[in-house]
Structure formats: C-alpha cells, structure tokens
C-alpha cells in the first residue's frame, strides 16, 4: 500500500480479520493518521510493544495514530488493542519511503520542522497537534488567578500564532502585568486576571498554506468574601486498631488567608462542655493554610487513649467553619469488633 | 545522547557576581526551551529561570528577578546565567534542564554547580 | 504565584507496599503538572509530565493522576530503588512552582 497525500485507514471503524495485517509506506515528513475502532472506544496504540502516549509527535489518542511528519525512526511495527483485552485489532508495519529530496546529514529530527533545511516536504496547511489540550472553552475563574490558553498547532512551513482579543490584535499592552506568549508552547497566559480581561480570547495559526482559529471565552468572578468552606466528608469516621497509624484529612477552600487548627474534644472533670457551653478541646495542630499537610492530622501508634472526637477548624478574615469527626480505636486482639460512631458533624 | 553540562560555580561574597554555564550537547539546542532551577543545601527544588528556545521569551522567580539574567548562545549550544548581588540565600546546586516540547517539563537535568554565597 | 503543597512530607513504606503521594495546587492548573525523583546528590528524573504522562524509560509502577487542583503520584508497588524525595511542579504559570518534596524512607 503507497501512502500518498495523507495516510488514513477509512472508515475509522475496527478493520475486519483480514484487513488486520497491512504494510504502509510512508515517505519522510508525511503526517500519517490511522484510526482503529470507534473515537470514543477505540484501540490503544502500541509501537514494539510499548505504548504510545495520548501526546507528543508521535501519539495514540483516541483509537487514533498519530505522527505529525514521518521520520525514520518512526518505522516500525505497531499494534492496536482493543481497550481492556489483548485482542489486536490492527497490525501494521510503517516503511520509510522516499523523501521528495534525500541528504546525507544525520540530523536531529526536530530540525525538519524548520523551512530552511535542504529537505523538502510536502506542504501542509497547520492542524492541531493537540487538541485534547483545548477542550476547555469556557474558563470561569476567580479574580486574582492565572489564566492560560493554548492552540498548539504544527504544518509545513511551521505556522505562526497570533492572539485576538473580541476580534482585535491583541499585545496585552494596555493590561497591568502584561501577558506572556510562548510561541514555542503555543500559549498566552494572563496573570492576576481583573474583570476587564473578560472576553473571547482567538489563537490564529497560520502559513502559507492556510490558516485555523480557536475560540476561548473567559469570565472573570470576582470574588465574594466569605469564610472557609470545608469539603464534605472530611475528616471521616475511622476505625483503628491499637497500635496503627491514623491520617484524619480536612479540605479547605477559602479566598482569604485561613488559618487551621486540629482539635480534639476532651473531658474534664466529667464533663466534656465548659459554663459557657464551647467544648472542652486541646489544640493538637495550628497553622496557615500554605504550610506542609496542615489539611491532615497523623496519629502514630494510636491507643485506646487516642479514641473520640477530632475537629478541623478553619478561620480566615471573614468568618469560622468546622467539621468533626470520631476515630474509634479497637482493641489489637479483636479486630473484628466494631463500635457504632456517631455521624460527622458539618456546621455552617 | 543528550547531555548538559554546568560550569562556573564557585565561592562568592555577597553583594558579588558570577556567571553560570550550561554547554549542552546530542540535541538541537535552538530547538528547546531550557531552565534553571536550583536547590539549597538540604532543601528542595526552586525553578528560577526559563528561556525560549530562540531566546524570544525569558521569564524569572520573584526571588531573583533584577538581580539574575538568563541568555543563551544557539550557535555554541551553550545556556547561561548571570548573576549579580548575590545573597547568603542563593547558596545552592544550580541545575540547568531542557524541556519537553509542548510541555513544561524538564526531561534532561545537569549534574548541577554548587554556588557558595559566603564572606 | 501559583503555591504548589506536597503531603505527606516524609512516608515509611516497605518494598512491595501501594505509595501514593498528593499534590495541591492553590488554583485550577488544569493538567499542567509534572513529578520527578531525587535521589542524594544527583539531579532530579522525570517520572510523569502532563499530570498522567508516563515519561519514557520509567517503570510502569509509577502513575500519575488528577487535574484542576488535586492530584496524585503513585508506585504501585515500591521497589528498593524507588526510596527518594518525589516533588510536583506546575508549569501553568510562567514560575514553574515545585512542591517541597516529600521524602519515601525504608520502614
């Protein structure tokens, strides 16, 4: 089988038994695409045994093969399994073909990228390299936060990229802290984004050849004040046996600053509430939120002493949030005994 | 195969200067965003500095910026930093690193140039 | 910047035990982060980029999962070779933020 303008195997369907052993020839620079079972179930792509990753220039991404320019070392056997079986649903061997032009350089393989080399491929208009990395088109974030947009895209010559903002060129001259474009990654990022970054943000990627556009929106929250959330759940009951380590985890979201603690609820003199009805607790765990796993509370080589109720308080500028939970410590010689905790509680 | 290597590390008084270097060799230099990073005896990893491939966009950590410079010569494969009014903290191992295209991460490290920032 | 918290900080597991460490990032980063291993006195490996991308020539124990702000590095099961310091590192941002490390010891 001659490969000629692009290599692809039709319909994107899983080949029948017969069609399984097939020999391509493709010449140098050549971008290839084979399908192999349906998009959203298809193959796993594998070249001499090892599997290919869903990006690079040589990927398998979603039933799909594919190369961006064909080099050398890119021939080979591949094989296409069906997802979660060792059954092969195509078995291929790629051929190095002719280039348009040959040289006796042992370039990098990168270097074909670049227009000027001696070698000469066939034009190609620009595609997208990885358009996994696009499907996010909405991008809602809050005030203060990073954004970052990417087309990344190849063809021959190697296209270029230009950023749009609602239709106009777009420099980020007139936005305090500027922009960042990395041509190389295809990429504009916007740092501290305000509400006036909000709009349609279009990459252009262009050549001589012909020319692709993306669309991205952004929307800017600004942000309300409000004291820590906790996520649900968390801590969790757990159940332990003497002598066990014990990891309590608590999830905390909050714009302002927080500040964490640990807690755990003791009694004193048979009591476990004070005159002023707080509960009687001993700080085990203080710290801000950027420190090392203040969000988990370890115990070690936990007794029955250790057993009972655990609080994970969050504070910031705005406001307090809490949420507990029991650890039930079981007896070493009988692990099979279990003890009813109490449901966690969520305070708001 | 791929290979970088640094040079020009060495003892510095604070306040002082020196001029890091990063000859990289088995790969198309101009083809790769590469980085610094660095690490403080005993501490973790601290990126400091990336550079384009053609040398178009150069970006630094806040702890260096105005102080540090990150150049590169394509046409002698070699990555370089400058760094003036150096201070007790930026005592480290700096590492020069080559990123993966598309992705920034850093798939070739060097064996790293210790900077002794001490009076 | 974009602060990037590694958890545990340390961990002592034995050879053949399921490792899993956490990465949290202090905003969506979508799948922008990588893992690497350090051992004393050498310079980092690249384990997984891209969040889940394992890098070529390391062992398939090691995977990588998670995105947004939440995610997980694990070794399925550790071998001997594998006691090190893990780090994550975004690079959504233009600074490239690690995470402080976290150190896998022998039990």
């Known amino acids: 089988l001659e490969a000629s303008e692009e290599v692809e195997l039709e319909p994107c369907l899983a080949p029948s038994l017969e069609q399984q052993e097939q020999e391509l020839t493709v010449a140098l620079g050549q971008p290839v695409r084979l399908c192999c079972g349906r998009a959203e179930r298809g193959g796993h792509w594998y070249k001499e045994g090892s599997r290919l990753a869903p990006a690079g220039r040589v990927r398998g991404w979603r039933g799909r093969l594919e190369i961006a320019s064909f080099l050398p070392e890119d021939a080979g056997r591949y094989l296409c399994l069906a997802r979660g079986s060792m059954i092969v649903l195509q078995n291929l061997t790629l051929i190095t073909g002719d280039s348009l032009t040959s040289s006796n350089d042992d370039e990098d393989p990168k270097s074909h990228r670049d227009p000027s080399n001696r070698h000469s491929y066939p034009q190609q208009a620009p595609y997208w390299t990885h358009p996994q990395r696009m499907e996010k088109k909405l991008h809602a974030v809050p005030a203060g936060n990073t954004v970052k947009f990417r087309c990344p895209a190849a063809g021959n010559p190697t296209p270029t990229i230009r950023w749009l903002k609602d239709g106009q060129a777009f420099h980020g001259e007139n936005r305090i802290g500027g922009i960042r474009l990395r041509h190389q990654h295809w990429s504009l990022v916007m740092e501290s984004v305000v509400p006036s970054d909000r709009g349609t943000y279009t990459c252009l990627v262009e050549n001589a050849v012909g020319s692709i556009r993306y669309n991205y929106l952004l929307d800017v929250l600004e942000r309300s004040p409000h004291r820590p959330i906790l996520q649900a759940g968390l801590p969790a009951n757990t159940t332990a046996v003497v002598g066990s380590d014990v990891e309590l985890l608590c999830k905390v979201y909050s714009d302002a600053q927080p500040h964490i603690q640990w807690l755990k609820h003791i009694v004193i003199n048979g009591s476990s509430f004070g005159a002023d009805g707080f509960p009687y607790v001993q700080v085990l765990k203080t710290a801000d939120i950027n420190s090392s796993e203040v969000e988990v509370l370890y115990l070690r080589n936990v007794s029955a002493e250790d057993a009972g109720e655990y609080t994970c308080l969050a504070g910031n500028s705005i406001g307090l949030s809490y949420q507990s939970a029991w650890l039930t410590v079981l007896p070493e010689e009988d692990p099979t005994w279990t003890a009813a905790a109490p449901e966690a509680r969520c305070t708001d | 195969q791929v290979q970088l290597l640094e040079s020009g590390g060495g003892l510095v008084q604070p306040g002082g200067s020196l001029r890091l270097s990063c000859a990289a060799s088995?790969?198309?230099?101009?083809?790769?965003?590469m980085s610094w990073v660095r690490q403080a005896p005993g501490k973790g990893l601290e990126w400091v500095s990336v550079i384009e491939g053609d040398g178009s966009y150069t970006h630094y950590a806040d702890s260096v910026k105005g102080r540090f410079t990150i150049s590169r010569d394509n046409s002698k494969n070699t990555l370089y930093l400058q760094m003036n009014s150096l201070r007790a903290e930026d005592t480290a191992v700096y590492y020069c690193a080559r990123e993966k295209t598309y992705s920034s991460a850093f798939d070739y490290w060097g064996q790293g140039t210790l900077v002794t920032v001490s009076s | 910047d974009i602060q990037m918290t590694q958890s545990p900080s340390s961990l002592s597991a034995s050879v053949g035990d399921r490792v899993t460490i956490t990465c949290r990032a202090s905003q969506d980063i979508s799948s922008d982060l990588n893992w690497y291993q350090q051992k004393p006195g050498k310079a980092p490996k690249l384990l997984i980029y891209?969040?889940?991308n394992l890098q070529s020539g390391v062992p398939s124990r090691f995977s990588g999962s998670g995105s947004g702000t939440d995610f997980t590095l694990t070794i399925s099961s550790l071998q001997p070779e594998d006691f090190a310091v893990y780090y994550c590192?975004?690079?959504?941002?233009?600074?490239?933020?690690f995470g402080q490390g976290t150190k896998v010891e022998i039990k």
């Open positions: 891209d969040a889940s």
């Open positions: 088995g790969f198309t230099f101009s083809d790769y965003a």
């Open positions: 590192q975004q690079h959504y941002s233009p600074s490239h933020t």
